[in-house]
Interface confidence: low
Protein backbone atom coordinates (compact mmCIF):
# COMPACT_ATOMS: atom_id res chain seq x y z
CA UNK A 1 0.00 0.00 0.00
CA UNK A 2 0.92 3.11 -0.13
CA UNK A 3 0.10 6.95 1.73
CA UNK A 4 -1.79 9.43 -0.08
CA UNK A 5 -1.14 13.45 1.01
CA UNK A 6 -0.54 16.91 -0.25
CA UNK A 7 2.95 18.38 -0.87
CA UNK A 8 1.81 21.88 0.23
CA UNK A 9 -1.48 22.58 2.13
CA UNK A 10 -2.78 26.53 1.89
CA UNK A 11 -4.63 27.88 4.11
CA UNK A 12 -6.22 31.47 5.23
CA UNK A 13 -5.34 32.81 8.74
CA UNK A 14 -7.98 32.44 10.66
CA UNK A 15 -9.89 29.19 8.39
CA UNK A 16 -9.64 25.16 9.27
CA UNK A 17 -6.57 23.05 7.50
CA UNK A 18 -7.52 19.96 6.48
CA UNK A 19 -4.33 17.83 6.89
CA UNK A 20 -4.73 14.81 4.33
CA UNK A 21 -3.50 11.80 5.27
CA UNK A 22 -4.67 8.23 3.64
CA UNK A 23 -3.94 5.12 3.53
CA UNK A 24 -4.28 3.59 0.24
CA UNK A 25 -3.61 -0.26 0.69
CA UNK A 26 -4.26 -4.25 -0.50
CA UNK A 27 -7.86 -5.47 0.17
CA UNK A 28 -7.70 -7.06 4.00
CA UNK A 29 -5.39 -4.37 5.37
CA UNK A 30 -5.97 -1.90 8.19
CA UNK A 31 -4.97 1.17 10.00
CA UNK A 32 -4.21 0.43 13.26
CA UNK A 33 -3.14 4.35 14.21
CA UNK A 34 -2.29 7.27 12.91
CA UNK A 35 0.15 9.41 14.95
CA UNK A 36 0.34 13.55 13.92
CA UNK A 37 3.21 15.18 14.77
CA UNK A 38 4.90 18.62 13.64
CA UNK A 39 8.26 18.39 12.32
CA UNK A 40 9.91 21.53 11.63
CA UNK A 41 13.65 21.47 10.69
CA UNK A 42 16.12 22.17 13.66
CA UNK A 43 13.48 21.09 16.42
CA UNK A 44 12.40 17.69 17.80
CA UNK A 45 9.04 16.21 16.82
CA UNK A 46 6.04 17.53 18.31
CA UNK A 47 3.39 14.97 19.16
CA UNK A 48 0.15 16.43 17.75
CA UNK A 49 -2.81 14.14 17.58
CA UNK A 50 -3.04 10.08 17.68
CA UNK A 51 -6.02 8.48 15.99
CA UNK A 52 -6.20 5.26 17.17
CA UNK A 53 -8.52 1.97 15.57
CA UNK A 54 -9.78 0.92 19.22
CA UNK A 55 -8.94 3.98 21.51
CA UNK A 56 -10.38 7.00 19.34
CA UNK A 57 -8.67 10.28 18.95
CA UNK A 58 -6.01 11.75 21.67
CA UNK A 59 -5.17 15.24 20.97
CA UNK A 60 -1.74 16.78 22.44
CA UNK A 61 -2.74 19.10 25.42
CA UNK A 62 -0.83 21.90 23.00
CA UNK A 63 -3.19 21.45 20.35
CA UNK A 64 -6.35 20.58 22.51
CA UNK A 65 -9.98 21.69 21.14
CA UNK A 66 -8.11 22.67 17.56
CA UNK A 67 -7.45 19.17 16.56
CA UNK A 68 -10.18 17.07 15.06
CA UNK A 69 -11.30 14.12 12.91
CA UNK A 70 -13.00 15.20 9.51
CA UNK A 71 -16.69 14.73 10.08
CA UNK A 72 -18.34 11.20 9.30
CA UNK A 73 -19.18 9.00 7.59
CA UNK A 74 -15.29 8.49 7.84
CA UNK A 75 -13.15 5.92 5.65
CA UNK A 76 -11.03 3.42 8.12
CA UNK A 77 -8.29 3.77 6.09
CA UNK A 78 -8.47 7.94 6.29
CA UNK A 79 -6.23 9.16 8.96
CA UNK A 80 -7.11 12.92 7.96
CA UNK A 81 -7.19 15.58 10.98
CA UNK A 82 -8.73 19.11 10.87
CA UNK A 83 -6.80 21.94 12.69
CA UNK A 84 -9.43 24.29 13.50
CA UNK A 85 -8.62 28.00 13.13
CA UNK A 86 -5.20 28.39 11.70
CA UNK A 87 -2.99 31.01 13.01
CA UNK A 88 0.41 31.73 11.82
CA UNK A 89 2.60 30.33 14.37
CA UNK A 90 0.86 26.66 12.60
CA UNK A 91 2.74 27.16 9.55
CA UNK A 92 5.23 24.56 9.17
CA UNK A 93 6.32 21.23 8.24
CA UNK A 94 3.75 18.18 9.64
CA UNK A 95 4.33 14.21 9.69
CA UNK A 96 1.88 11.35 9.12
CA UNK A 97 2.60 7.97 10.25
CA UNK A 98 0.36 5.23 10.02
CA UNK A 99 0.71 1.93 11.36
CA UNK A 100 -1.15 -1.09 9.17
CA UNK A 101 -1.42 -4.48 9.55
CA UNK A 102 -0.28 -6.51 8.17
CA UNK A 103 2.45 -4.10 5.98
CA UNK A 104 3.61 -1.85 8.65
CA UNK A 105 4.52 1.91 8.68
CA UNK A 106 4.34 4.12 6.46
CA UNK A 107 4.98 7.99 6.88
CA UNK A 108 4.74 11.31 5.04
CA UNK A 109 5.15 14.64 5.32
CA UNK A 110 3.08 17.64 4.50
CA UNK A 111 3.89 21.49 4.44
CA UNK A 112 1.08 23.68 6.02
CA UNK A 113 0.63 27.23 4.71
CA UNK A 114 -1.15 29.80 6.04
CA UNK A 115 -1.92 32.78 4.34
CA UNK A 116 -2.65 36.12 6.33
CA UNK A 117 -4.38 38.17 4.29
CA UNK A 118 -3.20 41.85 4.04
CA UNK A 119 -5.20 45.18 5.82
CA UNK A 120 -3.99 47.90 3.22
CA UNK A 121 -4.20 51.41 4.34
CA UNK A 122 -3.95 54.03 2.48
CA UNK A 123 -2.25 57.33 3.37
CA UNK A 124 -2.68 61.13 1.82
CA UNK A 125 0.56 62.78 1.55
CA UNK A 126 0.93 66.48 2.05
CA UNK A 127 -1.44 69.14 0.32
CA UNK A 128 -1.36 69.34 -2.89
CA UNK A 129 -0.28 72.80 -4.51
CA UNK A 130 -0.04 74.00 -8.61
CA UNK A 131 3.48 74.88 -9.02
CA UNK A 132 5.45 72.23 -6.72
CA UNK A 133 7.65 69.93 -7.90
CA UNK A 134 7.30 66.02 -7.66
CA UNK A 135 5.24 65.84 -4.47
CA UNK A 136 3.94 62.58 -2.52
CA UNK A 137 0.37 61.99 -3.20
CA UNK A 138 -0.21 59.04 -1.39
CA UNK A 139 1.47 56.48 0.24
CA UNK A 140 -0.35 52.82 0.45
CA UNK A 141 0.72 49.91 3.00
CA UNK A 142 -0.33 46.44 3.46
CA UNK A 143 0.92 43.78 5.48
CA UNK A 144 0.72 39.85 5.08
CA UNK A 145 1.64 36.59 4.62
CA UNK A 146 3.85 36.04 1.97
CA UNK A 147 4.45 39.81 0.87
CA UNK A 148 1.45 41.36 -0.72
CA UNK A 149 1.60 43.35 -3.67
CA UNK A 150 0.88 46.89 -3.98
CA UNK A 151 -0.02 48.73 -7.05
CA UNK A 152 -1.43 51.75 -8.05
CA UNK A 153 -4.55 51.92 -10.91
CA UNK A 154 -4.59 55.93 -12.26
CA UNK A 155 -5.29 57.77 -15.17
CA UNK A 156 -3.37 60.50 -13.48
CA UNK A 157 0.85 60.60 -14.92
CA UNK A 158 3.18 59.69 -11.70
CA UNK A 159 5.69 57.58 -10.56
CA UNK A 160 5.73 54.91 -7.86
CA UNK A 161 8.20 53.88 -5.39
CA UNK A 162 7.82 50.73 -3.22
CA UNK A 163 9.39 49.17 -0.04
CA UNK A 164 9.40 46.69 2.24
CA UNK A 165 9.76 45.79 5.61
CA UNK A 166 10.03 41.76 6.58
CA UNK A 167 8.88 40.95 10.21
CA UNK A 168 9.17 36.85 11.68
CA UNK A 169 6.07 36.26 10.23
CA UNK A 170 4.75 38.65 7.44
CA UNK A 171 6.25 41.25 5.66
CA UNK A 172 5.08 44.75 5.23
CA UNK A 173 5.09 46.59 1.48
CA UNK A 174 4.29 50.53 1.16
CA UNK A 175 3.84 51.71 -2.06
CA UNK A 176 4.37 55.63 -2.84
CA UNK A 177 2.69 57.48 -5.44
CA UNK A 178 4.61 60.91 -6.25
CA UNK A 179 3.09 63.18 -9.04
CA UNK A 180 3.50 67.06 -10.55
CA UNK A 181 0.36 68.42 -9.35
CA UNK A 182 -1.67 70.48 -11.74
CA UNK A 183 -4.98 71.68 -11.83
CA UNK A 184 -6.65 68.59 -14.89
CA UNK A 185 -5.92 66.67 -11.32
CA UNK A 186 -8.52 67.69 -9.37
CA UNK A 187 -11.15 64.84 -8.79
CA UNK A 188 -9.27 62.51 -10.30
CA UNK A 189 -8.97 59.32 -8.81
CA UNK A 190 -5.72 56.95 -7.29
CA UNK A 191 -6.75 53.85 -6.33
CA UNK A 192 -4.38 51.89 -4.58
CA UNK A 193 -4.33 48.17 -5.71
CA UNK A 194 -3.31 45.01 -2.93
CA UNK A 195 -3.26 41.49 -3.98
CA UNK A 196 -2.50 38.48 -2.29
CA UNK A 197 -2.95 35.01 -2.43
CA UNK A 198 -5.26 34.85 0.60
CA UNK A 199 -7.90 37.25 -1.25
CA UNK A 200 -10.62 36.23 -3.36
CA UNK A 201 -9.95 39.47 -4.77
CA UNK A 202 -7.93 42.19 -5.23
CA UNK A 203 -8.72 44.90 -2.36
CA UNK A 204 -8.92 48.31 -3.42
CA UNK A 205 -8.76 52.05 -1.54
CA UNK A 206 -9.78 54.83 -3.71
CA UNK A 207 -8.17 58.88 -3.11
CA UNK A 208 -9.90 61.64 -4.38
CA UNK A 209 -6.93 64.28 -5.10
CA UNK A 210 -7.62 67.37 -4.82
CA UNK A 211 -4.84 70.25 -5.80
CA UNK A 212 -4.77 73.52 -5.17
CA UNK A 213 -4.83 76.36 -7.75
CA UNK A 214 -5.68 80.23 -8.82
CA UNK A 215 -6.19 80.94 -12.38
CA UNK A 216 -5.51 84.31 -13.93
CA UNK A 217 -8.24 86.95 -13.21
CA UNK A 218 -9.94 88.78 -16.06
CA UNK A 219 -12.32 91.08 -16.33
CA UNK A 220 -15.53 90.67 -18.95
CA UNK A 221 -17.97 93.48 -19.55
CA UNK A 222 -15.88 96.05 -21.58
CA UNK A 223 -16.02 94.37 -24.82
CA UNK A 224 -18.38 96.66 -26.89
CA UNK A 225 -16.74 99.99 -26.07
CA UNK A 226 -20.18 102.47 -27.06
CA UNK A 227 -22.22 100.72 -25.16
CA UNK A 228 -20.73 102.33 -21.79
CA UNK A 229 -22.15 105.54 -22.13
CA UNK A 230 -24.08 108.08 -20.11
CA UNK A 231 -27.79 106.46 -18.85
CA UNK A 232 -26.96 103.52 -20.11
CA UNK A 233 -28.82 100.89 -17.53
CA UNK A 234 -27.70 97.31 -16.87
CA UNK A 235 -23.90 97.99 -16.94
CA UNK A 236 -21.64 95.21 -15.77
CA UNK A 237 -17.96 93.97 -14.87
CA UNK A 238 -18.06 90.31 -14.35
CA UNK A 239 -14.75 89.30 -12.69
CA UNK A 240 -13.52 85.74 -14.40
CA UNK A 241 -11.42 83.24 -12.77
CA UNK A 242 -11.30 79.43 -11.12
CA UNK A 243 -9.52 78.20 -8.16
CA UNK A 244 -9.69 75.23 -6.20
CA UNK A 245 -10.31 76.03 -2.79
CA UNK A 246 -13.43 77.94 -5.05
CA UNK A 247 -11.97 81.73 -4.76
CA UNK A 248 -13.68 84.94 -3.40
CA UNK A 249 -14.24 87.80 -5.13
CA UNK A 250 -13.68 91.69 -4.02
CA UNK A 251 -14.11 94.79 -5.88
CA UNK A 252 -12.60 97.77 -5.29
CA UNK A 253 -11.77 101.25 -7.22
CA UNK A 254 -8.43 102.44 -7.41
CA UNK A 255 -9.10 105.96 -7.92
CA UNK A 256 -11.32 106.48 -4.81
CA UNK A 257 -14.02 104.64 -3.37
CA UNK A 258 -16.77 102.44 -4.88
CA UNK A 259 -19.52 105.20 -6.49
CA UNK A 260 -22.92 105.46 -4.80
CA UNK A 261 -25.32 103.23 -6.72
CA UNK A 262 -22.43 100.13 -7.28
CA UNK A 263 -23.87 96.53 -6.11
CA UNK A 264 -20.93 94.14 -5.37
CA UNK A 265 -22.32 91.10 -6.05
CA UNK A 266 -19.57 88.74 -5.73
CA UNK A 267 -18.04 88.00 -8.94
CA UNK A 268 -20.09 90.67 -10.57
CA UNK A 269 -19.98 94.51 -10.27
CA UNK A 270 -23.45 96.26 -10.67
CA UNK A 271 -23.67 99.96 -12.04
CA UNK A 272 -26.88 102.09 -11.78
CA UNK A 273 -27.72 104.15 -14.94
CA UNK A 274 -24.39 105.42 -16.08
CA UNK A 275 -22.59 109.06 -14.98
CA UNK A 276 -19.56 110.45 -16.12
CA UNK A 277 -18.74 110.02 -12.20
CA UNK A 278 -18.85 106.09 -13.07
CA UNK A 279 -15.77 106.38 -14.55
CA UNK A 280 -12.34 105.25 -12.89
CA UNK A 281 -10.19 102.14 -12.40
CA UNK A 282 -11.43 99.16 -10.93
CA UNK A 283 -9.88 96.33 -9.37
CA UNK A 284 -11.26 92.78 -9.10
CA UNK A 285 -9.11 91.15 -6.46
CA UNK A 286 -9.52 86.98 -6.36
CA UNK A 287 -8.26 84.83 -3.59
CA UNK A 288 -8.40 81.70 -2.32
CA UNK A 289 -5.94 79.77 0.73
CA UNK A 290 -3.80 79.04 -2.38
CA UNK A 291 -3.54 82.30 -3.96
CA UNK A 292 -4.54 85.50 -4.89
CA UNK A 293 -4.75 87.36 -8.24
CA UNK A 294 -6.34 91.37 -9.72
CA UNK A 295 -6.93 92.44 -12.55
CA UNK A 296 -7.65 96.01 -13.41
CA UNK A 297 -9.67 97.85 -16.18
CA UNK A 298 -10.44 101.38 -16.75
CA UNK A 299 -13.70 102.70 -17.68
CA UNK A 300 -14.24 105.59 -19.37
CA UNK A 301 -18.34 106.37 -19.65
CA UNK A 302 -19.06 108.22 -22.72
CA UNK A 303 -21.17 110.88 -23.06
CA UNK A 304 -22.90 110.90 -26.76
CA UNK A 305 -23.32 114.56 -27.23
CA UNK A 306 -19.29 114.97 -27.01
CA UNK A 307 -17.27 113.79 -30.03
CA UNK A 308 -14.64 111.80 -28.37
CA UNK A 309 -13.75 107.72 -28.07
CA UNK A 310 -13.90 106.17 -25.70
CA UNK A 311 -10.52 104.71 -24.48
CA UNK A 312 -10.42 101.05 -22.60
CA UNK A 313 -7.41 99.91 -21.18
CA UNK A 314 -6.89 95.84 -19.98
CA UNK A 315 -4.42 95.40 -17.50
CA UNK A 316 -4.05 91.96 -16.03
CA UNK A 317 -1.66 91.36 -12.41
CA UNK A 318 -0.53 88.73 -10.26
CA UNK B 1 -17.80 38.16 18.28
CA UNK B 2 -15.37 40.88 18.25
CA UNK B 3 -15.35 42.90 20.86
CA UNK B 4 -13.46 46.15 21.60
CA UNK B 5 -13.68 47.68 24.95
CA UNK B 6 -11.85 51.24 25.29
CA UNK B 7 -10.60 53.02 28.54
CA UNK B 8 -8.11 55.81 30.08
CA UNK B 9 -10.16 58.41 28.99
CA UNK B 10 -10.76 61.68 31.53
CA UNK B 11 -10.12 65.23 31.82
CA UNK B 12 -7.12 66.78 31.70
CA UNK B 13 -5.36 70.24 31.54
CA UNK B 14 -3.81 71.71 28.95
CA UNK B 15 -0.06 70.03 28.20
CA UNK B 16 -1.33 66.97 30.28
CA UNK B 17 -0.72 63.85 29.62
CA UNK B 18 -3.03 60.37 29.38
CA UNK B 19 -2.39 56.77 28.36
CA UNK B 20 -5.93 55.17 26.41
CA UNK B 21 -6.22 51.26 26.37
CA UNK B 22 -8.31 49.34 24.23
CA UNK B 23 -8.76 45.56 25.23
CA UNK B 24 -10.01 43.25 22.07
CA UNK B 25 -11.39 40.18 21.94
CA UNK B 26 -13.25 38.22 19.47
CA UNK B 27 -10.52 37.67 17.00
CA UNK B 28 -6.77 36.59 16.48
CA UNK B 29 -5.78 40.23 17.64
CA UNK B 30 -1.82 40.22 16.65
CA UNK B 31 -2.98 39.24 12.75
CA UNK B 32 -4.61 42.35 12.08
CA UNK B 33 -4.35 45.80 11.80
CA UNK B 34 -5.95 48.69 14.88
CA UNK B 35 -6.37 51.92 14.44
CA UNK B 36 -7.52 54.73 16.82
CA UNK B 37 -10.12 57.17 15.95
CA UNK B 38 -11.59 60.04 17.42
CA UNK B 39 -14.49 62.57 17.03
CA UNK B 40 -15.11 66.04 18.51
CA UNK B 41 -18.86 67.45 18.93
CA UNK B 42 -20.44 68.49 15.90
CA UNK B 43 -17.35 67.09 13.94
CA UNK B 44 -17.00 63.95 11.75
CA UNK B 45 -15.02 61.16 13.16
CA UNK B 46 -11.56 61.22 12.23
CA UNK B 47 -8.34 59.23 11.76
CA UNK B 48 -5.77 59.23 14.69
CA UNK B 49 -2.90 56.67 14.75
CA UNK B 50 -2.67 53.34 13.77
CA UNK B 51 -0.72 50.15 13.85
CA UNK B 52 0.48 46.99 12.28
CA UNK B 53 -0.37 43.46 13.14
CA UNK B 54 3.01 43.02 14.33
CA UNK B 55 3.32 46.51 15.52
CA UNK B 56 6.00 47.17 13.46
CA UNK B 57 4.54 50.08 11.31
CA UNK B 58 2.78 52.80 12.77
CA UNK B 59 1.09 55.97 11.15
CA UNK B 60 -0.05 59.14 12.57
CA UNK B 61 -2.63 62.03 11.09
CA UNK B 62 -0.48 65.56 11.22
CA UNK B 63 -2.30 66.83 14.12
CA UNK B 64 -0.94 64.34 16.59
CA UNK B 65 2.79 63.47 14.89
CA UNK B 66 5.10 63.95 18.00
CA UNK B 67 2.54 64.23 20.58
CA UNK B 68 1.29 60.61 20.51
CA UNK B 69 2.10 57.55 20.71
CA UNK B 70 0.57 54.03 19.44
CA UNK B 71 1.42 50.74 20.92
CA UNK B 72 0.24 47.51 21.32
CA UNK B 73 1.24 44.00 23.54
CA UNK B 74 0.01 41.25 21.13
CA UNK B 75 0.12 38.77 24.56
CA UNK B 76 -2.52 41.17 26.48
CA UNK B 77 -4.55 41.76 23.34
CA UNK B 78 -4.35 44.85 24.28
CA UNK B 79 -3.98 48.53 22.16
CA UNK B 80 -2.25 51.71 23.18
CA UNK B 81 -2.48 55.11 22.73
CA UNK B 82 -0.08 57.25 24.91
CA UNK B 83 -0.97 60.94 24.52
CA UNK B 84 1.08 63.68 25.76
CA UNK B 85 1.13 67.48 25.27
CA UNK B 86 -2.49 67.28 25.09
CA UNK B 87 -3.95 70.49 23.54
CA UNK B 88 -7.66 71.92 24.02
CA UNK B 89 -8.67 70.39 20.38
CA UNK B 90 -7.77 67.02 21.16
CA UNK B 91 -11.39 66.98 23.00
CA UNK B 92 -13.24 64.25 21.65
CA UNK B 93 -14.66 60.95 22.19
CA UNK B 94 -11.51 58.37 21.24
CA UNK B 95 -12.30 55.42 19.60
CA UNK B 96 -10.39 52.11 18.64
CA UNK B 97 -10.95 49.96 16.05
CA UNK B 98 -10.01 47.06 13.54
CA UNK B 99 -10.94 45.98 9.98
CA UNK B 100 -11.30 42.58 9.51
CA UNK B 101 -12.71 40.02 6.98
CA UNK B 102 -10.94 38.27 3.78
CA UNK B 103 -12.45 36.42 1.59
CA UNK B 104 -14.08 39.74 -0.46
CA UNK B 105 -15.30 41.45 1.97
CA UNK B 106 -14.14 44.29 4.66
CA UNK B 107 -15.47 45.00 7.94
CA UNK B 108 -15.02 47.72 10.57
CA UNK B 109 -15.56 47.03 14.13
CA UNK B 110 -15.55 50.05 16.57
CA UNK B 111 -15.51 50.19 20.54
CA UNK B 112 -17.64 52.27 22.37
CA UNK B 113 -15.36 54.89 22.80
CA UNK B 114 -13.78 56.85 26.18
CA UNK B 115 -14.34 60.78 26.01
CA UNK B 116 -11.05 62.36 26.58
CA UNK B 117 -11.33 66.47 28.05
CA UNK B 118 -8.63 68.86 27.84
CA UNK B 119 -9.54 72.16 29.75
CA UNK B 120 -8.15 74.35 32.10
Known amino acids: GELETSDVVTVVLGQDAKLPCFYRGDSGEQVGQVAWARVDAGEGAQELALLHSKYGLHVSPAYEGRVEQPPPPRNPLDGSVLLRNAVQADEGEYECRVSTFPAGSFQARLRLRVLVPPLPSLNPGPALEEGQGLTLAASCTAEGSPAPSVTWDTEVKGTTSSRSFKHSRSAAVTSEFHLVPSRSMNGQPLTCVVSHPGLLQDQRITHILHVSFLAEASVRGLEDQNLWHIGREGAMLKCLSEGQPPPSYNWTRLDGPLPSGVRVDGDTLGFPPLTTEHSGIYVCHVSNEFSSRDSQVTVDVLDPQEDSGKQVDLVSAS | EVQLLESGGGLVQPGGSLRLSCAAS????????MGWYRQAPGKEREFVSS????????RYADSVKGRFTISRDNSKNTLYLQMNSLKPEDTAVYYC?????????????WGQGTQVTVSS
Open chain 2, 51 to 58: ISGSGGLT
Open chain 2, 26 to 33: GFTFSSYA
Open chain 2, 97 to 109: AVTTGYQGGVYDY
